[in-house]
């Protein structure tokens, strides 16, 4: 079995409305080759949050703060959080395939909860 692991270190993150949420994801390898995408929710109805290769995601920026020798950082930050952003976010590794990429491995997910904006 190949040892690529998808690590989402935080089970949950709580952010005040209007602030930014950082969702952390690390992987132990680039192999197998293929893209990394972020989704909210699981299964057929999941929502694509970020795909670096294609699409327009104006509220999402990539954050690679701490470079470690033994893993690769694929974290994102979502700006201007609203209650509608609450949910569980998954960092997903795909394997390059023909004609379509194949889902290879998902992180355990990070639940984002949104607090009311401080008055």
């Amino acid at each position: 079995e190949d040892e690529l692991q998808v690590i989402q270190p935080e089970k949950s993150v709580s952010v005040a409305a209007g602030e930014s949420a950082t969702l952390r994801c690390a992987m132990t390898s680039l192999i197998p080759v293929g893209p990394i995408m972020w989704f909210r929710g699981a299964g057929a109805g999941r929502e694509l949050i970020y795909n670096q290769k294609e699409g327009h995601f104006p509220r999402v920026t990539t954050v690679s703060e701490l470079t470690k020798r033994n893993n690769l950082d694929f974290s994102i930050s979502i700006s201007n959080i609203t209650p509608a952003d609450a949910g569980t976010y998954y960092c997903v590794k795909f394997r390059k395939g023909s004609p379509d990429d194949v889902e290879f491995k998902s992180g355990a997910g990070t639940e984002l909860s949104v607090r009311a904006k401080p008055s």
Partner: antibody, heavy 118, light 111 residues
């Protein structure tokens, strides 16, 4: 101490075959992506093949695809490159290299020389 | 394929001075804020040795007179101050996309 020791190089005629081996020690071989990189005076360094840590996935550039086959035996800490239908342009020093994250080449062997000539 | 143009091909620098080597990729090698460009040193008769990984990270055991910078398509390796044992050929390498490719090398000599 990390060690990668290549063997199996030599002189072969065009169209012939060779099997290169790389014996690894000093690190957890089964956790590493492994690759071969070759070097010629004319073309510099060229990536040749890569295999995932468990051996499931292999990758090759077009220049060797269909002719070279990379495999590994994690129980023996060994990497193998089967080279068929060799051409003069395959003449090079072949290095075995490890990649902890499948990104940069962390460690390199001393290399083994392959000469393809009639 | 991502083509890497490395310059200069050779460089003569006085001991104690700064040596600067450049690599330009034909397309971005960045992903999620990671820059997949790496630098190696090769001395005659030896294999390449990793110096800098992912654009700017010093490999363990490498002297801190070596540094790397850059992102997307433009990257730089700096040696400051240059010492006699730094005479070697330096290569950059991208692992941002297959096929992985290398620069043509820069031979660094003492002026």
């Amino acid at each position: 101490e990390v060690q990668l020791v290549e063997s199996g190089g030599g002189l072969v005629k065009p169209g012939g075959s060779l099997r290169l081996s790389c014996a690894a020690s000093g690190f957890t071989f089964s956790s590493y992506v492994m690759s071969w990189v070759r070097q010629t005076p004319g073309k510099g360094l060229e990536w040749v093949a890569t295999i995932s840590s468990g051996g499931t996935y292999t990758y090759y550039p077009d220049s060797v695809k269909g002719r070279f086959t990379l495999s590994r035996d994690n129980a023996k800490n060994s990497l193998y490159l089967q080279m068929n239908s060799l051409r003069a342009e395959d003449t090079a020093v072949y290095y075995c290299a490890s990649q902890l994250t499948g990104s940069e080449f962390d460690y390199w062997g001393q290399g083994t020389t392959v000469t393809v000539s009639s | 394929d991502i083509v890497i143009t490395q310059s200069p091909a050779s460089l003569a620098v006085s001991l104690g001075e700064r040596a600067t080597i450049s690599c330009r990729a034909s397309e971005s090698v960045d992903s999620y804020g990671n820059s997949f460009m790496h630098w190696y040193q090769q001395k005659p008769g030896q294999p390449p040795k990793l110096l800098i990984y992912r654009a700017s990270n010093l490999e363990s055991g490498v002297p801190d007179r070596f540094s790397g910078s850059g992102s997307r398509t433009d990257f730089t390796l700096t040696i400051n101050p240059l010492q006699a044992e730094d005479v070697a050929t330096y290569y950059c390498h991208q692992s941002g996309d297959l096929p992985w490719t290398f620069g043509g090398g820069t031979k660094v000599e003492i002026k």
